[in-house]
Interface confidence: medium
């Protein structure tokens, strides 16, 4: 069952899935000047059995100018650097994900893919939030949102995260100066289509993915 809407937005924060539940779809989007090859897939699909999950289909982009030539799917290192949506740079190095049954890892990039990925999530999907660069979380621990089915309708739980800028902090004698927050990138979203960009995830998020302290609180 696909989730009806996007994970909630949080001011000055961005989200990322650590792993994708079977049934998740990822649109095959190409960057400006390129298009899907004519016989190419519209989307990649996370499928599998109890022991192994993987992405079905491959996304392939070709130059809009050339009709018949198809580009190789294998990404070149310099092309990975192009995948950004803001001036804020952060390494495209998600932490190693635990191999969860029934989940796919982040799909590798394909050549000339769009700067944003549009996912269609399924019920049970969990996404993790973190503050973008220059902002600090006021809550401790992983902030996540889960797509749940309630009374036949899907909804995302509200993540417990507040991101505040260091410049906003009132510095009185005896008050600590805040530490810098982890790096991240803002995202853009369109209704019913979830777009995410890669950003660096704190290692402890992966470690607590299955045993989150917030799953039962405030939902």
């Amino acid at each position: 069952e696909l989730c009806d809407d996007d994970p909630p937005e949080i001011p000055h924060a961005t989200f990322k899935a650590m792993a994708y539940k079977e049934g998740t779809m990822l649109n095959c989007e190409c960057k400006r000047g390129f298009r899907r090859i004519k016989s190419g897939s519209l989307y990649m699909l996370c499928t599998g059995n109890s022991s192994h999950s993987s992405w079905d289909n491959q996304c392939q982009c070709t130059s809009s100018a050339t009709r018949n030539t198809t580009k190789q799917v294998t990404p070149q290192p310099e092309e990975q650097k192009e995948r950004k949506t803001t001036e804020m740079q952060s390494p495209m190095q998600p932490v190693d994900q635990a191999s969860l049954p029934g989940h796919c890892r982040e799909p590798p990039p394909w050549e000339n893919e769009a700067t944003e990925r549009i996912y269609h999530f399924v019920v049970g999907q969990m996404v993790y939030y973190q503050c973008v660069q220059g902002y600090r979380a006021l809550h401790r621990g992983p902030a996540e949102s889960v797509c749940k089915m309630t009374h036949g309708k899907t909804r995302w739980t509200q993540p417990q995260l507040i991101c505040t800028g260091e410049m906003e902090t009132s510095q009185f004698p005896g008050e600590e100066k805040p530490q810098a927050s982890p790096e991240g990138r803002p995202e853009s979203e369109t209704s019913c289509l979830v777009t995410t960009t890669d950003f660096q995830i704190q290692t402890e998020m992966a470690a607590t993915m299955e045993t989150s302290i917030f799953t039962t609180e405030y939902q």
């Epitope: 937005e9 401790r140 509200q158 417990q160 302290i213 405030y218």
Partner: antibody, heavy 116, light 107 residues
Framework: QVQLVESGGGVVQPGRSLRLSCAAS????????MAWVRQAPGKGLEWVAV????????YYRDSVKGRFTISRDNSKNTLYLQMNSLRAEDTAVYYC?????????WGQGTLVTVSS | DIQMTQSPSSLSASVGDRVTITCRAS??????LNWYQQKPGKAPRRLIY???SLQSGVPSRFSGSGSGTDYTLTISSLQPEDFATYYC?????????FGQGTKLEIK
């Protein structure tokens, strides 16, 4: 079941001090930001101060900066608001709240009256 | 600070009526808007977050919409328990600010 219980309100003269407390239970207090919100009699709501889970970040509305101090004791699951140099315009019901994005866990409030 | 202006300040309506309350922000708040209901002597209760997401346990007759600077709370069919004061609140940037409130009374 989340519970927030404020105490420490009362009648105080202008220029004097008062300390409010908020005892929290039913959730992992040390993981969550907390805040104080106030409401003057017959008036609207306003955020007073917010504190991060570990107390390292504090935010105040301009009208209370330098007079009010928000703090917390995670070992006691308690939030505090130290109010100094009180003014008549500080008269209000003071609520403590958590789950700030969700914004739906509030105490019952404690009334502070500043009057000579 | 971002100013939040609600209209009307008060309104009278009857059970079964459809009611709309509007909230205007002094600058773009990116849909980071909550709606609260408050009854006399009680703490506020959040109805809607993120402009249009219904708080768990809140009846579906409440709905929210809007973007940019203009937002709306709609009650599709007023029930006796809905007569209260309603506040909008932005959480786009600190200090978070509330509207001045809209008092909904029985006609």
């Amino acid at each position: 079941q989340v519970q927030l219980v404020e105490s420490g309100g009362g009648v105080v003269q202008p220029g004097r001090s008062l300390r409010l407390s908020c005892a929290a239970s039913g959730f992992t207090f040390s993981n969550h930001a907390m805040a104080w919100v106030r409401q003057a009699p017959g008036k609207g709501l306003e955020w007073v101060a917010v504190i991060s889970y570990d107390g390292s970040n504090k935010y105040y509305r301009d009208s209370v900066k330098g007079r009010f101090t928000i703090s917390r004791d995670n070992s006691k699951n308690t939030l505090y608001l130290q109010m100094n140099s009180l003014r008549a315009e500080d008269t209000a019901v003071y609520y403590c709240t958590t789950g700030l994005n969700s914004g739906y866990d509030w105490g019952q409030g404690t009334l502070v009256t500043v009057s000579s | 600070d971002i100013q939040m202006t609600q209209s009307p300040s008060s309104l009278s309506a009857s059970v079964g009526d459809r009611v709309t309350i509007t909230c205007r922000a002094s600058q773009n708040i990116n849909s980071f808007l909550n709606w609260y209901q408050q009854k006399p002597g009680k703490a506020p209760r959040r109805l809607i977050y993120g402009t249009s997401s219904l708080q768990s346990g809140v009846p579906s007759r409440f709905s929210g919409s809007g973007s940019g600077t203009d937002y709306t709370l709609t009650i599709s069919s007023l029930q006796p328990e809905d007569f209260a004061t309603y506040y909008c609140q932005q959480y786009n940037s600190w200090p978070w600010t509330f509207g001045q409130g809209t008092k909904l009374e029985i006609k």
